[in-house]
Interface confidence: medium
């Protein structure tokens, strides 16, 4: 056969290049949250829309019960933006009747949960002061970075005050990840 004269002297197998469209990916968008009681050092997890509007999950990347489930090991880019909004934040008004009903800062954490580890791992954290902003304020916090994840890892987004999350538009508050 004509092709044989060009065959290399040793066999070499090349894995086919994987199309980007086959890689696990997800983009989740904000929905209205239902706050529940917690201790102040416990940052509640947000829940998300995963199929309507701009939201999607593809290629075995699944969303369930506030978690994005990682279907295969690899390097992933993980990102989230949470927009907070409030009515007032003068520092003198923050502690009403001795109660910290309004925070003096807002925090977003992207957390990884691995079943074999007893404690969740904080992957990314962002904090902003809300003392110096105006009476009706909006503050987005964006986080994004690459991480090596294992199959079965779970990702979630935690916030310091779920009652301040702006759930009005899907382009204001979102969460996603994709395999690089």
């Amino acid at each position: 056969l004509k092709g044989q004269e060009f065959a290399p002297s040793h066999q070499q197998v090349y894995a086919p290049l994987r199309a980007d469209g086959d890689k696990p990916r997800a983009h989740l968008t904000v929905v209205r949250q239902t706050p529940t009681q917690h201790f102040k050092n416990q940052f509640p997890a947000l829940h998300w829309e995963h199929e309507l509007g701009l939201a999607f999950t593809k290629n075995r990347m699944n969303y369930t019960n506030k978690f994005l489930l990682i279907p295969e090991s690899g390097d992933y880019f993980i990102y989230s933006q949470v927009t907070f909004r409030g009515m007032t934040s003068e520092c003198s008004e923050i502690r009403q009747a001795g109660r910290p009903n309004k925070p003096d800062s807002i925090t977003v954490v992207i957390t990884k949960v691995t079943d074999s580890y007893p404690e969740p791992t904080q992957l990314l954290m962002g904090t902003k002061s809300v003392c110096e902003v105006g009476s009706n304020w909006f503050q987005p916090i964006y986080l994004g970075a690459m991480f090596s994840l294992q199959e079965g890892d779970k990702l979630m987004v935690n916030v310091s005050d779920i009652s301040l999350v702006d759930y009005t538009k899907e382009d204001k508050t979102f969460f996603g990840a994709f395999l690089l």
Epitope: T36, Q37, F39, K40, N41, G98, R99, P100, N101, I162
Partner: antibody
Framework: QVQLVESGGGVVQPGRSLRLSCAAS????????MHWVRQAPGKGLEWVAV????????LYTDSVKGRFTISRDDSKSTLYLQMNSLRAEDTAVYYC????????????????WGQGTTVTVSS | DIQMTQSPSSLSASVGDRVTITCRTS??????LGWYQQKPGKAPKRLIY???SLQSGVPSRFSGSGSGTEFTLTISSLQPEDFATYYC?????????FGQGTKVEIK
């Protein structure tokens, strides 16, 4: 007046189960988080569990996780603690206590306590 | 877990004395701390909330102070009915934790 009355305590063998109840009166039970706190004989106070005002959030101290279950029945204004696989170290007076629930987001400790019910785990 | 160090573990005092009990926490808890009084065979009773606010119905001789990691309960003039065990409680962090208690006895 605001009142909490615990019941259901008693003597039980290790490995057995017991269910404690706490009947609330004098306030809108469904608006408050509720705690269980215990006190071993001659010892200090130890927090055991909490349930949020809406029943959606339940938290436990490590030593009872997987064995104890806190629940509430707002229609009966009653708090429960189901205690399974009891151990000698669970011997204590068990108090139910109301969380002040100043906002719906945070727990604030305990402002009203019941008189307690005694649980003795012994063979 | 946040560790609570309450001191002293016991003290002897006379009626009319000024008594101070201290509670230290292993982490900053802002003012998320309460003080409780317990008499033998009775349920605890809350005296102070938010570190310094007096619970309704509690005599004004009781006061609380502090923020962050160091807190104090003061009884300005000890009365016969004040002989009891006192506990601090932090509710900032899960799990909430009590101090070991301070027993106030008659000298």
């Amino acid at each position: 007046q605001v009142q909490l009355v615990e019941s259901g305590g008693g003597v039980v063998q290790p490995g057995r189960s017991l269910r404690l109840s706490c009947a609330a009166s004098g306030f809108t039970f469904s608006s408050y988080g509720m705690h269980w706190v215990r006190q071993a004989p001659g010892k200090g106070l130890e927090w055991v569990a909490v349930i949020s005002y809406d029943g959606n959030n339940k938290l436990y101290t490590d030593s009872v996780k997987g064995r104890f279950t806190i629940s509430r029945d707002d229609s009966k204004s009653t708090l429960y603690l189901q205690m399974n696989s009891l151990r000698a170290e669970d011997t204590a007076v068990y108090y139910c206590a109301r969380d002040p629930t100043v906002t719906l987001y945070y727990y604030y400790g305990m402002d009203v306590w019941g008189q307690g019910t005694t649980v003795t785990v012994s063979s | 877990d946040i560790q609570m160090t309450q001191s002293p573990s016991s003290l002897s005092a006379s009626v009319g004395d000024r008594v101070t009990i201290t509670c230290r926490t292993s982490q900053d808890i802002r003012d998320d701390l309460g003080w409780y009084q317990q008499k033998p065979g009775k349920a605890p009773k809350r005296l102070i909330y938010d570190a310094s606010s007096l619970q309704s119905g509690v005599p004004s001789r009781f006061s609380g102070s502090g923020s962050g990691t160091e807190f104090t309960l003061t009884i300005s003039s000890l009365q016969p009915e004040d002989f009891a065990t006192y506990y601090c409680l932090q509710h900032n962090s899960y799990p909430p934790t009590f101090g070991q208690g301070t027993k106030v006895e008659i000298k």
